[in-house]
């Protein structure tokens, strides 16, 4: 929106004419005191829309806010609005007239308010006084709005001097009402019940002595009324409670229960709603997924978590290899099931400093008289690899062999590498990988065994070296998902009389 003149504040002469032009990409309109004064709607050559407000024969009563806004703000991205404030200094108008309701200012809390005494001339000095006092109060004044501050329950007037006469405004009355705003809370003994069980809801309002409760609930819509009971909580002042009790719930009692509270002094009201679900029978439902294969690292702690929904509260059992688990006195296993909301549960199995023997088939079972659910997974204990043996030998065939043996879980990979230049390798030169089938210098033979008892893999790899003509550093590296280990041995030629 483009406004000419742009303002934001104009001072105009009494009896003069003044034109305000507003243009925009959609139809625009001038507003004054929430009304549209007579104005010319027009369209410019460039296709923009304009509205021209011609103010003629201006008087002090034309002082105030003028807004330009889009005629129909629907569909426009911003509900843009341009504000102009016009002063028309007029010695015949003292304070601008107020509506009757502006003279009575009601408060229900300590808050800043504005006493809206306004003048037509921004140059006038305006002061605020208690109605029966001469002393000017130290409250800031805005010529466009009035005096703003925190006021006590008193009567106030504004004063100004126009020419040589003192002018008083109407009296403004500030009243602070000691009525609490209504704050309602609604809760239910249970928001999920089985058919045949009871629904009990409580609606509590605080800080008021006289209130009226009105309940809305599914049964009411079908004409079956339930009489609520209202009582005062004597241990807490101004706590009033309404109890709605529905015995032997039916499926049709599912839905929204609303408590509406009104107080008649100030016609305040508040309402809160709660949803109740009546189920045919109880249920247990798993939330989220737990993979059928879980991992834990040897000697580390591991918590396995299952989230589920249930009503009524279920019994939860954990099994390992079909044997029931319980909290161990040695603190190696901890079981806990906690209620995180009315019908949501988290069950946790914590294995402290995991041992190999704790690998196996685990099951969590949650059940009550109406339903049950179970979840199973295999727990694999991951063991970091370690090289247990690296040895070199000279069989009669003339070749030289290096044997590497190691263990870990999951199955380790073996990598053989060698350094021919002992001075520079491996710091300066990278080691050469060995065991490639294309290379005739070396042959590799690897065997893998799974040890059921220890629940880990053993890898034995033999490297055959055809001819070693100078000392060679041979390195065996074992790797798996949880670590790696390396050992090395120096292999010397047959011809040399020493071996490192």
């Amino acid at each position: 929106l483009v406004v000419t003149p742009p303002g934001p504040e104009l001072v105009l002469n009494v009896s003069s004419t003044f034109v305000l032009t507003c243009s925009g990409s959609a139809p625009v309109v001038w507003e004054r005191m929430s009304q549209e004064p007579p104005q010319e709607m027009a369209k410019a050559q460039d296709g923009t829309f304009s509205s021209v407000l011609t103010l003629t024969n201006l008087t002090g009563l034309d002082t105030g806010e003028y807004f330009c806004t889009h005629n129909d703000s629907r569909g426009l991205e911003t509900d843009e609005r341009k504000r102009l404030y016009i002063f028309v200094p007029d010695p015949t108008v003292g304070f601008l007239p107020n509506d009757a309701e502006e003279l009575f200012i009601f408060l229900t809390e300590i808050t800043e308010i504005t006493i809206p005494c306004r003048v037509t001339d921004p140059q006038l000095v305006v002061t605020l006084h208690e109605k029966k006092g001469d002393v000017a109060l130290p409250v800031p004044y805005d010529h466009q709005r009035g005096f703003s501050g925190i006021f006590e329950d008193r009567s106030y007037i504004c004063k100004t001097t126009i020419g040589d006469r003192e002018v008083d405004s109407d009296a403004y009355y500030v009243y602070r009402l000691q009525v609490s705003s209504i704050n309602v809370s609604v809760n239910a003994v249970q928001t999920v019940v089985r058919q045949g069980e009871n629904i009990t809801l409580m609606c509590i309002v605080i800080g008021n002595e006289v209130v009226n409760f009105e309940w809305t609930y599914p049964r009411k819509e079908s004409g079956r009324l339930v009489e609520p009971v209202t009582d005062f909580l004597l241990d807490m002042p101004y706590h009033i409670r309404s109890i709605l009790h529905i015995p032997s719930a039916e499926l049709e009692d599912s839905g929204t229960y609303t408590c509406n509270v009104t107080e008649s002094v100030n016609d305040h009201q508040d309402e809160k709603a709660i949803n109740i679900t009546v189920v045919e029978s109880g249920y247990v439902r798993l939330l989220g997924e737990v993979g059928t294969l879980q991992f834990a690292e040897l000697h580390r702690s591991r918590t396995l978590q299952v989230v589920f929904e249930a009503y009524p509260p279920p019994t939860v059992l954990w099994f390992k290899d079909n044997r029931t688990l319980g909290d161990s006195s040695a603190g190696e296993i901890a079981l806990s099931t906690r209620n995180v909301s009315e019908t949501r549960y988290v069950s946790e199995l914590t294995l402290v400093r995991v041992k190999v023997a704790e690998a196996g088939h685990y099951t969590m079972r949650a059940f009550h008289e109406d339903a049950e659910v179970q979840l199973s997974f295999q727990l694999q204990i991951n063991v970091p690899v370690r090289v247990l043996e690296l040895s070199e030998s000279h069989p009669d065939s003339g070749e030289q062999t290096v044997r590497c043996r190691g263990r870990g879980m999951p199955q380790p990979n073996i990598i053989w590498s060698a350094c021919r230049d002992l001075k520079r390798c491996p710091r300066e030169l990278p080691p050469t990988l060995l065991g490639n089938s294309s290379e005739e210098e070396s042959q590799l033979e690897t065997n893998v065994t799974y040890w059921e008892e220890e629940q880990e893999f053993e890898v034995v790899s033999t490297l055959r070296l055809q001819h070693v003509d100078r000392p060679l550093s041979v390195r065996c590296t074992l790797r798996n998902a949880v670590g790696q280990d390396t050992q090395e041995v120096i292999v010397v030629p047959h011809s040399l009389p020493f071996k490192v």
Partner: nanobody, 117 residues
């Protein structure tokens, strides 16, 4: 404060043309809004066209496409070219100028335009 003098009015037949001129007593280059209004017998003074400081000219719907307003700052003149005149265009035409600093608008004395059928 500027003074405005209109000229160019007269009697013309329906469908004819007239060009109104408005001479300003001082520079119009800094004047925020200049325009033309008209007052028909027994009616309120109403907008015909207004040219804002940014150069945009706005016409009332009844004259759009028939009237063209222009502003010649070098000569301190404002013009209203009126074509396809209709009997309903009969009125006293006033030149108008406005700047915020003046705290109001300034009118010329008016020029009579009569369109006969």
């Amino acid at each position: 404060e500027v003074q405005l003098v209109e000229s160019g009015g007269g009697l013309v037949q329906a469908g004819g043309s007239l060009r109104l001129s408005c001479a300003a007593s001082e520079s119009i280059s800094s004047i925020e809004q200049m325009g033309w209004f008209r007052q028909a017998p027994g009616k309120q003074r109403a907008l015909v066209a207004i040219n804002t400081y940014g150069g945009r000219t706005v016409y009332t719907n009844s004259v759009e496409g028939r009237f063209t307003m222009s502003r010649d700052s070098a000569k301190n003149m404002v013009y209203l070219q009126m074509t396809s005149l209709e009997p309903e265009d009969t009125a006293v035409y006033y030149c108008y100028a406005q700047t915020t600093a003046w705290r109001g608008g300034v009118w010329g004395q008016g020029t009579q335009v009569t369109v006969s059928s």
